[in-house]
């Protein structure tokens, strides 16, 4: 996990489409009820941004204490600052609170960059612009961090969305998710539209944007455009997928695909990148600078370091190629692809330079823990955390920010060959998961 | 080793257009790792950079000077030039051209400099 | 627009002194800074890079450090030929165009 790439803290085989297309399944299968349609009191409860992390808004405690959350599926503890830190405007006060139980434990989160330690307990939890329910869950109050909270960022606390196997200290403490799915009617899935601004924000505009929505127990029309496209959960731990193949302007990488989810593929909105596993990285860059090969950018921009300014208004978007990823389908030997702007992976910064520039960070950077979809990623998508069904799907956010000749895509069906060897096994050792 | 050699007009009279070449000796200009550049340095003042061009073509300006600079380059000379149109008194200064090396960020090796008085 | 501010302005030392020049930015600039000499008559030469790395042929004498916003330019032991207007440029935002205003360091 790393501070600012991963937030809080913290960027042969494979799937040749053959020319032989599959047919479309055209039978929806039944729906369950209030699943889908409009869930309008949750459509934009989110705000933030990729590179500092988009946040829900949640009421803890009795009487209720408002705080902001940053919403994670890369983790599974929901934990909150609860002592007085200089980037906190608020925090938990778990004294002032008639329904905090202690659960006795401490938890301690170290991260490569950073980490947080508190004290577990439960409380009553809820959130305003979502479902109307209250749920008893666990809280890890946060009375100790380094790196971990992000001045200017306007959060205060993180929800981890993802399963139990990764909840600390261990995974008999019940993630909020879990906990709210059990205690109430609301169906095991949740929606997430993240929307990058595609241009800087100051702190002001941060505070009166809308950053996306996170749609909890179904799936929101309004948010979308065309098809939705599900690729399976490979293992509940991580919300973990299998890339089968990446085509940068529709050239193959042409790797093994077992390098793209070495040593895992997960979708996480708690991480500002795309960040890719070393070689895959070096072999994208590559070609990217390849296909931008008219222009040279400084080496210290491919490492995501420096920022490249041009005049306001001015960004060469059409130098810079589509990137696309090929997910496995839910069909034997069937894919899809989803595919990214630069407007996605360049992300815009806050003004350094003049308020005549339009400054970018090279927003897909280098792994050593798998390939993470990041923010940069989900923000061309609407993604559905399909729980109750083991899988993700994908589809073109109706929030992307794009240009009149290129929009994001989502593109199937395509004929993918063994995709079951593209998945990397792990070696079972007690490997802490946390500290990448 | 590369040397960098600035020529041109040394007075050029104003509302005209200063126009001056950097010849590369010693090393190809079409090497595709660096940027080669121009700054500028008025009389007992501080620099200015101005602009930049690729050997492909590509050009970064200014700001404050983009509406009036062209920077091109012809590869088959090993040359790069830049024409600075409705000068005044203001553009008087000693010029530089440059190499942009380490990263394309700094600039790493210099001409000597000309310098270009904008006088009637 | 990232403004460098150097200082002071004038140094006055004598041969054999330390000379410590500051080069301030005015929000962060990561590493990417650099220190250029300048004789009179005579181009700028690259010093100091990637804010403390040598350029080639540079004297062990001259060393650069810092990062974010506080940038430091020594001259261990100022040899006659050090005498000379230093400039510091940042990087972080590309392209290169920000120079610092200069620090003039003269013979006391």
């Known amino acids: 996990t790393q501070h600012g790439i991963r937030l809080p803290l913290r960027s042969g085989l494979g799937g040749a489409p053959l020319g032989l297309r599959l047919p479309r399944e055209t039978d929806e299968e039944p729906e369950e009820p209030g699943r889908r349609g409009s869930f309008v009191e949750m459509v934009d409860n989110l705000r933030g941004k990729s590179g500092q992390g988009y946040y829900v808004e949640m009421t803890v405690g009795s009487p209720p204490q408002t705080l902001n959350i940053l919403v994670d599926t890369g983790s599974s503890n929901f934990a909150v600052g609860a002592a007085p830190h200089p980037f906190l405007h608020r925090y938990y006060q778990r004294q002032l609170s008639s329904t905090y139980r202690d659960l006795r434990k401490g938890v301690y989160v170290p991260y490569t960059q950073g980490k947080w330690e508190g004290e577990l307990g439960t409380d009553l939890v809820s959130i305003p612009h979502g479902p109307n329910v209250t749920v008893r869950a666990n809280i890890a109050a946060i009375t100790e961090s380094d790196k971990f909270f992000i001045n200017g960022s306007n959060w205060e606390g993180i929800l981890g969305l993802a399963y139990a196997e990764i909840a600390r200290p261990d995974d008999s403490l019940e993630p909020f998710f879990d906990s709210l799915v059990k205690q109430t009617h609301v169906p095991n899935l949740f929606s997430l539209q993240l929307c990058g601004a595609g241009f800087p924000l100051n702190q002001s505009e941060v505070l009166a944007s809308v950053g996306g929505s996170m749609i909890i127990g179904g799936i929101d029309h309004s948010l979308y455009t065309g098809s939705l496209w599900y690729t399976p959960i490979r293992r509940e731990w991580y919300y973990e997928v299998i890339i089968v193949r990446v085509e940068i302007n529709g050239q193959d990488l042409k790797m093994d695909c077992k390098e793209y989810n070495y040593d895992k593929s997960i979708v996480d909105s708690g991480t500002t990148n795309l960040r890719l596993p070393k070689k895959v990285f070096e072999a994208a860059v590559k070609s990217i600078k390849a296909a931008s090969s008219t222009e040279k950018f400084p080496d210290g921009f491919w490492l995501g370091e420096q920022l490249v300014c041009w005049q306001a208004g001015t960004t060469p978007w059409n130098i810079f190629p589509v990137i696309s990823l090929y997910l496995m389908g839910e069909v034997t030997n069937q894919s899809f692809r989803i595919t990214i702007l630069p407007q996605q992976y360049l992300r815009p910064v806050e003004d350094v330079a003049t308020s005549q520039d339009d400054c970018y960070k090279f927003a897909i950077s280098q792994s050593s823990t798998g390939t993470v979809m990041g923010a940069v990623i989900m923000e061309g998508f609407y993604v559905v955390f399909d729980r109750a069904r083991k899988r993700i799907g994908f589809a073109v956010s109706a929030c992307h920010v794009h240009d009149e000749f290129r929009t994001a895509a989502v593109e199937g069906p395509f004929v993918t060959l063994d995709m079951e060897d593209c998945g990397y096994n792990i070696p079972q050792t007690d490997e802490s998961t946390l500290m990448t | 080793q590369l040397q960098l050699q600035e020529s041109g007009p040394g007075l050029v009279k104003p509302s005209e257009t200063l126009s001056l070449t950097c010849t590369v000796s010693?090393?190809?200009?079409?090497?595709?790792?660096?940027?080669w550049g121009w700054i500028r340095q008025p009389p007992g003042k501080g620099l200015e950079w101005i602009g930049m061009i690729y050997y492909s073509g590509s050009t970064w300006y200014n700001p404050s000077l983009k509406s009036r600079v062209t920077i091109s380059v012809d590869t088959s000379k090993n040359q790069f030039s830049l024409k600075l149109s409705s000068v005044t008194a203001a553009d008087t200064a000693v010029y530089y051209c440059?190499?942009?090396?380490?990263?394309?960020?700094?600039?790493?090796?210099w001409g000597r400099g000309t310098l270009v008085t904008v006088s009637s | 627009e990232i403004v460098l501010t150097q200082s002071p302005a004038t140094l006055s030392l004598s041969p054999g002194e330390r000379a410590t020049l500051s080069c301030r930015a005015s929000?962060?600039?990561?590493?990417?800074l650099a220190w250029y000499q300048q004789k009179p008559g005579q181009a700028p030469r690259l010093l100091i890079y990637g804010a403390s790395k040598r350029a080639t042929g540079i004297p062990a004498r001259f060393s650069g450090s810092g990062s974010g916003t506080d940038f430091t330019l020594t001259i261990s032991s100022l040899e006659p030929e050090d005498f000379a207007v230093y400039y510091c440029q940042q990087v972080y935002t590309w392209p290169p165009r920000t120079f610092g205003g200069g620090t003039k360091v003269e013979i006391k």
């Open positions: 929000q962060s600039v990561s590493s990417y």
């Open positions: 440059a190499r942009v090396g380490h990263g394309v960020s700094y600039f790493d090796l």
């Open positions: 010693g090393g190809s200009i079409s090497r595709g790792s660096y940027y």
